[in-house]
């Protein structure tokens, strides 16, 4: 893989991770609970990420081709010296599926990424059964190992799981914030060497990387901050009880001074940046009904106002192996009548405070095309069409038949596989179209199957506007207009002239324009004009006319 100039100025084929903010590096992960209902919002399960004893980094095995759970589950072991990768640690691409990840591990920073290599080492670890979103949105891989900006301590002595634990039926919802360690510009990693005469650390150092879980009370609309510490700490002004700070208002900062007899001054001053109320966000299905068979749209909606800076709120989605960092996502090319699950989370100041899983079933798709078996006319006024129904779900059929510019459509029962067309016009080409349709969120029409036939011939209708006029004493001029319905392939006009019961003339022309000469004077004649279409003669139009006495 050739080196590629990265957006951050690095030259590497595997783009190093760039933190989304200047927040300290994460040392914990939060497991995402699987959705088991159509829509479960703010419903989470607490999961502890156990690290492999020999490595500071573990990686979730791919769950399926979709990699629905393929996030790196990473953290820093409390007794391990972080492993800084060398060239030998370059990631070998898996021959199998992707493991897309929101974040890597603090220990996985590479001091000098080599162009053309990868900036993270992948160590197979435990397999997680649920998709996991790391709590912090950053992938903390930078060209230098930056730890903290306000402490000289090395990596944290303990890695807490930062989770949001809730049951939607409970009054409490759990949100989380993390304060992690970041020594000032130093890339020194401490080892596990234990001094023989350890001095007490300062409380500021000891609790430098303290993590906090925010529990939200839906009734009081207040938060409780739970301090994730092993011992019962003391807070200045007695603001905490049993390591909990109560009655915190959303979107307000609170300062807590933390001390304990195991550490010395200065105390740890913890700023609690309280997130917005969880119920102020709703994951909304924004799919257009017309496209709901093959697309999904999901959008986080702010259903109530709050005073937190919306710039500090970030959104994430994962659907299968696709990750999004938008408030709204649209997926296309989906299968109709199929269930899809998307996991989403909202972060405040880069710390997750709520999440939701949504299972959406795409709408019924357009039915397939019926298969026409035959389509023919066996009579002048009738036709028949038979078909096999499409495979996909449908409600009914629409059969349309078009002659010239005239179109008639019929709604047919879904169980029909044959239809007899009646009252058709003889010797007429009919184009038939048959499609199935389904009434879903909207009516969706399937592709139409087409066929055509020409009805059989029938006797033509009568000629009309027939006239007989005398052109001379013994000559007549007979004219008529064509029949309204020819009903056959050919066009021929016939004229029969009778005197009494005797046929005296029988002529046939392409046009209805006959000049009859040399008739007897002063004789009554019967003129019969009719149309013949090649198969059938029409009804004759009959007129009587007499010749006059010869004028000479």
């Amino acid at each position: 893989q050739s080196p590629t100039p990265s957006p951050t100025g690095l030259t590497t084929a595997k783009m190093p991770s760039v933190p989304l903010s200047s927040d300290p590096l994460p040392t914990h992960t939060t497991a995402f609970s699987p959705a088991s209902t159509f829509e479960r919002e703010n419903d989470f399960s607490e999961t502890t990420t156990s690290l492999s004893p020999d490595n500071t980094s573990t990686q979730v095995s791919p769950d399926s081709l979709d990699n629905a759970s393929a996030f790196n589950t990473t953290g820093v072991s409390s007794v391990q010296t972080p492993h800084l990768p060398t060239h030998a640690d370059s990631q070998t691409p898996s021959a199998g599926t992707d493991t897309q990840t929101f974040s890597g591990s603090a220990a996985n920073a590479k001091l000098n990424p080599t162009p053309g290599s990868n900036a993270i080492s992948d160590v197979p670890g435990e397999r997680s059964t649920a998709s996991t979103f790391p709590t912090d949105p950053v992938s903390p891989l930078t060209t230098t190992l930056s730890l903290a900006h306000h402490s000289s301590a090395a990596l944290p002595a303990r890695t807490s799981n930062t989770t949001i634990t809730a049951n939607t039926s409970d009054a409490y919802l759990n949100a989380s914030e993390t304060t992690t360690l970041s020594p000032s510009g130093s890339a020194v990693i401490s080892t596990t060497t234990i001094a023989t005469t350890p001095s007490k650390p300062t409380c500021d150092e000891k609790y430098a990387n303290i993590t906090v879980d925010y529990l939200y009370n839906k009734e009081t609309k207040l938060f409780t901050a739970k301090l994730n510490v092993n011992e019962n700490v003391e807070c200045g002004n007695n603001t905490c009880t049993n390591n909990e700070v109560h009655n915190l208002t959303e979107c307000k900062n609170a300062s807590v001074s933390i001390s304990h007899n195991s550490c010395t001054a200065p105390d740890k001053t913890l700023i609690l940046d309280v997130p917005p109320g969880v119920e102020k966000f709703q994951l909304h299905d924004c799919t257009q009904v017309e496209k709901a068979d093959t697309t999904i749209c999901l959008k986080w909606k702010n259903i109530e106002t709050f005073t937190c800076d919306t710039q500090n709120i970030t959104y994430r989605f994962q659907c299968g192996n696709m990750i999004f960092d938008n408030k709204e996502i649209k997926l296309e090319n989906l299968e109709p009548e199929h269930e899809y699950k998307c996991d989403s989370e909202i972060l405040y100041n880069n710390h997750k405070f709520t999440n939701a899983s949504k299972i959406i079933k795409t709408d019924f798709g357009s039915p397939g095309e019926p298969q026409i078996i035959f389509c023919r006319s066996e009579a002048a006024h009738q036709g028949v069409i038979t078909w096999n129904p499409p495979q996909r779900s449908f409600h009914n059929f629409t059969l349309c038949y078009i002659k010239e510019t005239e179109k008639d459509c019929l709604n047919l029962d879904k169980n029909l596989i044959k239809y007899d067309l009646q009252n058709l016009k003889p010797y007429t080409k009919y184009v038939l179209s048959l499609h199935a349709y389904i009434i879903a969120k909207v009516q969706r029409n399937g592709s139409a199957a087409m066929c055509h036939f020409t009805t059989k011939s029938a006797p033509p209708s009568q000629v009309w506007n027939m006239t007989v006029s005398m052109t001379s004493d013994n000559s007549m001029h007979v004219k008529c207009r064509p029949p309204r319905d020819r009903n056959g392939p050919h066009e021929r006009y016939h004229l029969e002239v009778e005197a009494g019961n005797t046929l005296v003339r029988n002529e046939s022309h392409k046009n209805c324009d006959f000049r009859v000469k040399d008739l007897q004077y002063s004789t009554d004649y019967t003129f019969k004009a009719y149309f013949h279409n090649g198969d059938y003669p029409g009804e004759p139009f009959i007129l009587h006319h007499s010749t006059s006495y010869n004028s000479k």
Epitope: A13, K14, P93, Q100, A119, C319, D325, E339
Partner: nanobody, 124 residues
Framework: EVQLEESGGGLVQPGGSLRLSCAAS????????MSWVRQAPGKGPERVSI???????????SYADSVKGRFTITRDNARSTLHLQMNSLKPEDTAVYYC??????????????WGQGTQVTVSS
């Protein structure tokens, strides 16, 4: 070794079309989520399109609002090739276009592989 090689970039007039291709090797292409990411001069990277799989359905796509209805991402698993059909091009589409194995986001960069990019310039 993962290799991604883009082609098909060039100079085109506004309203014109281009088809970018990305030849992939060194990994199982059909199982992988793939993206097109562009970077205009002086701007951050923007993922314009992604193709992946969700719930057993492969070939699922998504587009940035800025290109929706104009760009189409497709993949040819038999040839391990990713395509981006770009129609109705605008001057603001001018950028280097990268083929990415992965999601092509800041947050996923650690596990993404990027090609070297192909320049697309839309100008009259």
């Amino acid at each position: 070794e993962v290799q991604l090689e883009e082609s098909g970039g060039g100079l085109v007039q506004p309203g014109g079309s281009l088809r970018l291709s990305c030849a992939a090797s060194g990994f199982t292409f059909s199982n992988s989520v793939m993206s097109w990411v562009r970077q205009a001069p002086g701007k951050g990277p923007e993922r314009v399109s992604i193709i992946g799989s969700v719930g057993g359905t492969s070939g699922v796509t998504s587009y940035a609002d800025s290109v929706k209805g104009r760009f189409t991402i497709t993949r040819d698993n038999a040839r391990s090739t990713l395509h981006l059909q770009m129609n109705s091009l605008k001057p603001e589409d001018t950028a280097v276009y990268y083929c990415v194995k992965g999601n092509g986001l800041t947050s996923t960069r650690a596990s993404d592989y990027w090609g070297q990019g192909t320049q697309v310039t839309v100008s009259s």
